[in-house]
């Protein structure tokens, strides 16, 4: 399973003062769904991991891409199948012999615990409760993000309510 | 326009296997994932599975896992959906449908239909 | 599995009626609702996605609404060729499910 997906909007101007500028929101697009300071977009069909990479970026977006632990037990709690996998922005760099984020850099040891070999066309998937590492070239769900952008729009007090 | 076009009516025994075919036509074949719907009598719509054409990828209702296969000939833009072990229970209309975006879950070109008839 | 309920199973109508079907799920969906017209013997088309998008090509007298569990299908004003079967499908999970539809009638 997947979870619900609803509209996001976080209002980040404590106090509103009487103006014709509306508060300034943080939008997900429509479909995407609101994780903190992300959107993601969970797919509804399979690729191996280089067109689940490629597919994100015509969404002008990228694989996901996990910060720290805390990060990856609330994506974690968004699936609700343990039999479901999701391909992440994560693979094995055999020039560099270490896990390489798709933004460049290198997956600390403390970030995330891989299970599974390292080693040449290795790429990392999530599930409900782990993180495996699985040949490149097999195929699973996977998962976009992109970061919330601000919108400012020009509107009377009036809509506020 | 967009067109799935499914192989005629099948009737089979109980234990035998049915391989029901979709030709695909007016978009690229490889660009949409197929899915597979079926509709026994009395009941709901069931959903079965998936095949990514491009890839081949496919991702099934663990309901059928064990009994169904996906495949695809992309040479003639064709999906097929293979049921084994088939019960009387598996009577009903099979439906390919094509899924509309890789992000969301919806159909929106459906096949005609096949109706698959098992029984003794 | 997430179960949608349908209701009515059947309606009654007359050309320029409006109607409403309703499909309630068993756990919250958010908007990932579709609607879909089946007319006998012939393939289901889609109308509505996301709860309240219209597909193209879809006459504007369809609309729907809701989010969460309750969702609805409307038709503002009856018109000869909408005697149908409607249904509904949720994609909240991978695992899709459907409606058990509504047969609308002309009265």
């Known amino acids: 399973q997947k979870p619900s997906i609803g509209k996001c909007s976080v209002d980040i101007q404590q106090n509103r003062t009487k103006t014709t500028e509306r508060p300034d929101l943080l939008n997900c697009p429509i479909y995407w769904q609101q994780v903190q300071e992300k959107c993601l977009l969970f797919s509804h069909t399979v690729n191996p991991w280089n067109n689940s990479l490629a597919d994100c970026s015509t969404k002008e977006s990228s694989l996901l891409l996990i910060q720290d632990k805390d990060e990856l037990t609330r994506t974690q709690n968004l699936i609700h199948d343990k039999a479901i996998s999701f391909w992440i922005g994560l693979n094995f760099s055999l020039s560099e012999k270490n896990w390489k984020w798709i933004n460049g850099s290198f997956l600390s040891s403390n970030d995330l615990k891989i299970t599974g070999d390292a080693k040449e066309n290795s790429c990392v998937y999530i599930s409900q409760t782990s993180v495996y590492s699985e040949y490149c070239s097999t195929e699973m769900k996977w998962i976009c993000q992109k970061e919330l952008t601000l919108v400012r729009n020009k509107v009377s007090p009036d809509s506020w309510l | 326009q967009v067109q799935l076009v499914q192989s005629g009516a099948e009737v089979k025994k109980p234990g035998a296997s049915v391989k029901v075919s979709c030709k695909a036509s007016?978009?690229?074949?490889?660009?949409?994932?197929m899915n597979w719907v079926r509709q026994a009598p009395g009941q709901n719509l069931e959903w079965i599975g998936l095949?990514?054409?491009?890839?081949?990828?496919?991702y099934y209702n663990q309901k059928f896992k064990d009994r169904v296969t996906l495949t695809v000939d992309t040479s003639i833009s064709t999906a097929y959906m293979e049921l084994s072990r088939l019960r009387s229970d598996d009577t009903a209309v099979y439906y390919c449908?094509?899924?509309?975006?890789?992000?969301?879950?919806?159909?929106?070109?459906w096949g005609q239909g096949t109706t698959v008839t098992v029984s003794s | 599995d997430i179960q949608l309920t349908q209701s009515p199973s059947f309606l009654s109508a007359s050309v320029g009626d409006r109607v409403t079907i309703t499909c309630k799920a068993s756990?919250?969906?958010?908007?990932?609702v579709v609607w879909y017209q089946q007319k006998p013997g012939k393939a289901p088309k889609l109308l509505i996605d996301?709860?309240?998008i219209r597909h193209t090509g879809v006459p504007s007298r369809f609309s729907g609404s809701g989010s969460g569990t309750e969702f609805t299908l409307t038709i503002s004003s009856l018109q000869p060729e909408d005697f149908a079967d409607y249904f509904c499908?949720?994609?909240?999970?991978?695992?899709?499910?459907f409606g058990g539809g509504t047969k609308l009638e002309i009265k």
């Open positions: 449908a094509r899924l509309g975006d890789n992000y969301r879950g919806y159909f929106d070109s």
């Open positions: 095949i990514n054409p491009n890839t081949g990828g496919t």
């Open positions: 996301w709860a309240s």
């Open positions: 007016g978009y690229s074949f490889t660009g949409y994932t």
């Open positions: 756990q919250d969906v958010g908007t990932a």
């Open positions: 499908q949720q994609y909240s999970t991978y695992l899709y499910t």
